[in-house]
């Protein structure tokens, strides 16, 4: 038997993605999980093998369909469970009712690109990958840029509480190499957290023109 | 690109039993769950059971449980169906699919499949 604490957590992506982390004190590392949903109004159930990620904690994914396909609605409720092999049978370690838009975490934003780049300032775009038709324009985004000399837990966060994806960096030194990340959440959901962050760009400001004061 | 094959088909009489057997072939199966699903004439496709790719957990259909077992040989990159105490009502097309990282009792998750093969049980 495993004792312990036990911690449950799954996040849906809005579009076909149950992202799970299953935490247990005590726990051997080589116990057989897995995660099963039983969704409440749908006709299919899926399950997803609970692979080790640390010492005491386990992940999967389940994937209910093509990335951009709308798999499940702000009324659906899944079921989770997780499940262990002891023996010939299977143990329920842990069960909760998911609410899959109130336990958002949407995917990074993608394809970050520099639209502008002067001396002082640096134009940034980028796009959201996988998200819900269902939030219209009801997102909110987080950034950060990497000066040279910094780490990233030192970068301030620049707010953006509209879904704007775009942004003007500004008051940037002239010729230093930076690097810009950013993340998004919906406004929806009593659980919902942060995307991941973006993976980071690199830009470089361009170098102050000779002769004159910077 | 996975690639599948069935075999094993053919024709037995009621209260008799068979073995199906899928051949996977093509990029690694590591992360990849094989069905078994059947589709009688003017029929849906139904689900009947799918296996897991590391831990070979299984799951069934209830119409199914207790007389068919799902089981994967890694060494032979198989997955076979054995099919006990067979019936009429057993008589269809029995195909293999796979996708990723998930098993789902729905036919329409899975994006690779096999030709088929025929299962006829005679009474």
């Known amino acids: 038997a495993v004792n312990g604490t036990s911690q449950f957590t799954c996040f849906y992506n809005s579009r076909a993605n149950i992202s799970c982390v299953w935490s247990q004190d005590g726990a051997l590392q080589d116990t057989s999980c897995q995660v099963h949903a039983w969704p409440d109004r749908r006709r299919w159930n899926q399950t997803c093998e609970l692979l080790p990620v640390s010492q005491a904690s386990w992940a999967c994914n389940l994937i209910l369909g093509a990335p951009d396909s709308q798999k499940l609605t702000t009324v659906d409720i899944v079921t989770l469970r997780v499940l262990c092999r002891e023996g010939v049978r299977w143990r329920v370690m842990a069960i909760q009712d998911f609410k899959p838009f109130e336990n958002l975490r949407l995917m990074a934003p993608i394809s970050l690109q520099v639209v502008h780049v002067e001396t002082h300032r640096c134009n940034i775009s980028w796009e959201i990958s996988q998200a819900s038709h269902y939030f219209e324009r009801h997102l909110e985004f987080e950034a950060r840029t990497l000066s040279p000399g910094h780490t990233w837990e030192e970068a301030p966060l620049l707010t953006l509480k509209q879904k704007q994806e775009w942004i003007c960096l500004e008051t940037l030194t002239p010729d230093t190499q930076y690097e810009f990340q950013v993340r998004v959440k919906p406004l929806q959901g009593e659980f919902t957290t942060w995307s991941p962050w973006s993976q980071p760009l690199a830009f470089r400001t361009k170098p102050a023109a000779l002769g004159k004061d910077t | 690109q996975v690639q599948l094959v069935e075999s094993g088909g053919g024709l037995v009489q009621t209260g008799d039993s068979l073995r199906l057997s899928c051949a996977a072939s093509?990029?690694?199966?590591?992360?990849?769950?094989i069905a078994w699903f059947r589709q009688a004439p003017g029929k849906e496709r139904d689900f009947l059971a799918y296996?897991?790719?590391?831990?070979?957990?299984?799951w069934y259909a209830d119409s199914v449980k207790g007389r068919f077992t799902i089981s994967r040989n890694i060494a032979k990159r198989t997955v076979d169906l054995e099919m006990n105490s067979l019936e009429p009502e057993d008589t269809a097309v029995y195909y293999c699919?796979?996708?990723?990282?998930?098993?789902?009792?729905?036919?329409?998750?899975?994006?690779?499949w096999g030709q088929g093969t025929q299962v006829t049980v005679s009474s």
């Open positions: 699919a796979a996708r990723e990282h998930s098993g789902s009792t729905a036919w329409e998750h899975y994006d690779h």
């Open positions: 093509g990029r690694s199966l590591d992360t990849t769950y």
């Open positions: 296996i897991s790719p590391r831990f070979s957990h299984t």
